[in-house]
């Protein structure tokens, strides 16, 4: 079954409404905001999660603090348009008819325009670099232990196939996790690296998307790995198209 049967909840997505109205009285869960049915045995797409987050009552939503390190996803939260599979639509527009093109992780990759703006295809983000700084510890983590634990984390918690974790680099206190997934590599049923990175980002921020009030418990040989800052860089299969005006502003 696709959800925790006993109390009909979605283990992998707390931003859902679940009820035993599936086939044969099975537990079925729908994402808040979009009402789309979700598969609770795997991650929910980032697009549906953002939509659910924006639909939550304002007083229930955590305020997003603009970070001095927000180098890439500068636009922050928005209420996205998702396709029937839950992926981002290539063109996103706000209520004032300002439109822009996004990549597969929903990050803007063009200048903003009007309703005449065309986004011919959803460009895939095929390489994600997660740059972390951990809090001071008694000594450095053993690199091979750290590598193994982070790979296990992405495999077990985020259901990401190990072949998509390209590398784990470590120079105390900086950890870099490289995720790579070309269109040709991603098979049906594979978790998308963008979704895995988003779940990880929310876990690191203490805003876990998994069921319950608890958070991430990440340890390397028993020593807690606590992150004090995160930067995520996205590389697309086709380079973004920003005007020179934006680059010199």
């Amino acid at each position: 079954h696709t959800a925790a049967q006993d109390n009909c909840t979605c283990p992998t997505n707390k931003m859902t409404v679940c009820s035993p109205d599936g086939p044969g009285g099975r537990c079925q869960c729908r994402a808040l905001g979009s009402g789309m049915a979700v598969d609770c045995s795997t991650l929910t797409s980032k697009c549906l999660l953002l939509k659910a987050r924006m639909s939550a009552p304002k007083n229930a939503r955590t305020l997003v603090r603009p970070s001095e390190h927000a180098l890439v996803d500068n636009d922050g939260l928005y209420d996205p348009d998702c396709d029937p599979e839950g992926r981002f639509k290539a063109r996103q527009c706000n209520q004032t008819s300002v439109c822009w093109c996004v990549n597969s992780v929903g990050v803007r990759r063009t200048d903003k325009g009007d309703l005449s703006l065309r986004c011919d295809e959803l460009v895939r983000t095929h390489h994600i670099l997660i740059d972390l700084r951990h809090r001071p510890t008694a000594g450095a983590f053993n690199h091979s232990d750290l590598d193994a634990e982070l790979r296990r984390l992405f495999r077990e918690r985020y259901r990401l196939h190990p072949k998509f974790v390209a590398a784990v680099h470590y120079e105390q206190p900086t950890i870099q996790i490289e995720l790579r997934q070309n269109t040709s590599q991603k098979a049906a049923g594979d978790v998308d690296i963008g979704d895995a990175a988003y779940y990880f980002e929310r876990d690191i921020k203490g805003e876990s998307l998994f069921q319950g009030r608890g958070g991430l418990d990440l340890r390397v040989r028993g020593e807690p790995l606590q992150v004090e800052r995160t930067l995520i860089y996205y590389l697309d299969e086709i380079p973004p198209k920003f005007s020179m005006k934006r680059l010199t502003a």
């Epitope: 009030r213 608890g214 958070g215 991430l216």
Partner: nanobody, 123 residues
Amino acid sequence: QVQLLESGGGLVQPGGSLRLSCLASGRTVGRTAMGWFRQPPGKEREFVATISWAGGTTYYADFVKGRFTISRDNSKNTLYLQMNSLRAEDTAVYYCAASEPYSDYDPSGMVYWGKGTLVTVSS
């Protein structure tokens, strides 16, 4: 997906002891927080105790503190509940539960459940 199978329940006299076991199977059990819950006859299911995946942190309901001990053996994929000084009000079906991998020991994060084992405390 995690599968859980409880054992060790039975009839015991007041003041007696019992040890429950829960065998976990599935690809992720080594990194799941786990816990025990119980459902007394005619009542709601209630939290008993939880333990972190590394085993270093435990959390108990007030009514079992000092009497029950939760522990785990990750090499055997097994969770235990040692129950001492049992009382009639401890009579219940005891359920083993597990979290998603790498979740902490918060009881609200338990999403996978066993079928339960009945503990009856009676003279």
